[in-house]
């Protein structure tokens, strides 16, 4: 019979025949030949192969070098990589989680929307008009202004994006 | 190797503004942020800020908040650090440094003059 | 801000005599999360800053070890056992808790 050209998925071509790729966390040992299938060898400890394939080599495991902020969020398998993400307070640079940038905090006058985690950033809002923040944090919303009325009290000193309203007592002198 | 490699010196009239590049190369670029320090004649270290390149996402000192610009070009591997209304203040040396173990790598520095 | 605050600002050594650098911050550098973001950078004259300490102890890559880093969370110390003639310069702390990051005022290490 004619040599093959082209193999069906999960296998690869090699000295004109088909032979199977290793599965997920195993790596190739030899082709598979006229008369044998072909040997693979799971991946060792800390290694990892994620495809079908024709490696001779697994990947090692991403190290989660903890002198640059990084913890394991998940352990790697013979099958997948680990997953490295930030300590508290940080969060990963970028998707590769290589590094990691220490978290923002929203300046007086600016409140978080939505705060930070471990892949992404403090996400800061101006204050509106009626809302205030005299701190800078990474966690603290825009606060209301007092409500002066309801406490029977009236507005002495407006209020501002980064200051309260301060509220006195009403005048009892009216003419 | 990592390398940053900046722009040459520059001398600028007050009011105007200054761009200073540093170009990153031995490292993946966006897996770390960028940041801008200067240091005045005979002074010590001040932050200006850094960028994050993957995100394209700044965060600069309030003291130079609505002066100061910094981007990045991921295709060139390149910071890049604007700063405008110059005044005799800013004559300074401008370093960028990558935040890695701490500030691990850091650019020959780029002397920025200001005077009429 | 957080202020940082070096003593001495000028440091004359004999060379094979210890000497101390002194660092404090208006705040204590210690995160809930357990470290302490305190760094240490040495600027030899005409050269670029280089790190010699991160998280307050850790020793950077090829630096000697008669370098030592050691502190609480506001009061920080750099020892050097033995001075040699290439470690003199500007030796700054930096806090890295929070924006802005702040430096100390340096302190200019010579040789008598």
């Known amino acids: 019979p004619e040599p093959p050209t082209a193999c069906r998925e999960k296998q690869y071509l090699i000295n004109s025949q088909c032979c199977s790729l290793c599965q997920p966390g195993q790596k190739l040992v030899s082709d598979c030949t006229e008369f044998t299938e072909t040997e693979c060898l799971p991946c060792g400890e800390s290694e990892f192969l994620d495809t079908w394939n024709r490696e001779t080599h697994c990947h090692q495991h991403k190290y989660c070098d903890p002198n640059l902020g990084l913890r394991v969020q998940q352990k790697g398998t013979s099958e997948t990589d680990t997953i490295c993400t930030c300590e508290e307070g940080w969060h990963c640079t970028s998707e590769a989680c290589e590094s990691c940038v220490l978290h923002r905090s929203c300046s007086p006058g600016f409140g978080v929307k939505q705060i930070a985690t471990g892949v992404s950033d403090t996400i800061c809002e101006p204050c509106p008009v009626g809302f205030f923040s005299n701190v800078s944090s990474a966690f603290e919303k825009c606060h209301p202004w007092t409500s002066c009325e309801t406490k029977d009290l009236v507005v002495q000193q407006a209020g501002t994006n980064k200051t309260d309203v301060v509220c006195g007592p009403q005048d009892r002198l009216r003419a | 190797e990592v390398q940053l490699v900046q722009s040459g010196a520059e001398v600028k009239k007050p009011g105007s503004s200054v761009k200073v590049s540093c170009k990153a190369s031995g490292y993946t670029f966006t897996s770390y942020t960028m940041h801008w320090v200067r240091q005045a004649p005979g002074q010590g270290l001040e932050w200006m800020g850094y960028i994050n390149p993957s995100s394209d996402y700044p965060n600069y000192n309030q003291k130079f908040k609505d002066r100061v610009t910094i981007t990045a070009d991921k295709s060139t591997s390149t910071a890049y650090m604007e700063l405008s209304s110059l005044r005799s203040e800013d004559t300074a040396v401008y370093y960028c440094?990558?935040?890695?173990?701490?500030?691990?790598?850091w650019g020959q520095g780029t002397t920025v003059t200001v005077s009429s | 801000d957080i202020v940082m605050t070096q003593s001495p600002l000028s440091l004359p050594v004999t060379p094979g005599e210890p000497a101390s650098i002194s660092c404090r911050s208006s705040k204590s550098l210690l995160h809930s999360n357990g470290n302490t973001y305190l760094y240490w950078f040495l600027q030899k004259p005409g050269q670029s800053p280089q790190y010699l300490i991160y998280r307050m102890s850790t020793l950077a890559s090829g630096v000697p070890d008669r370098f030592s880093g050691s502190g609480s969370g506001t009061d920080f110390t750099l020892k050097i056992s033995r001075v040699e003639a290439e470690d003199v310069g500007v030796y700054y702390c930096?806090?890295?808790?929070?924006?802005?990051?702040?430096f100390g005022q340096g302190t200019k290490l010579e040789i008598k």
């Open positions: 930096m806090q890295h808790l929070e924006y802005p990051l702040t």
């Open positions: 440094a990558r935040w890695g173990y701490s500030f691990d790598y």
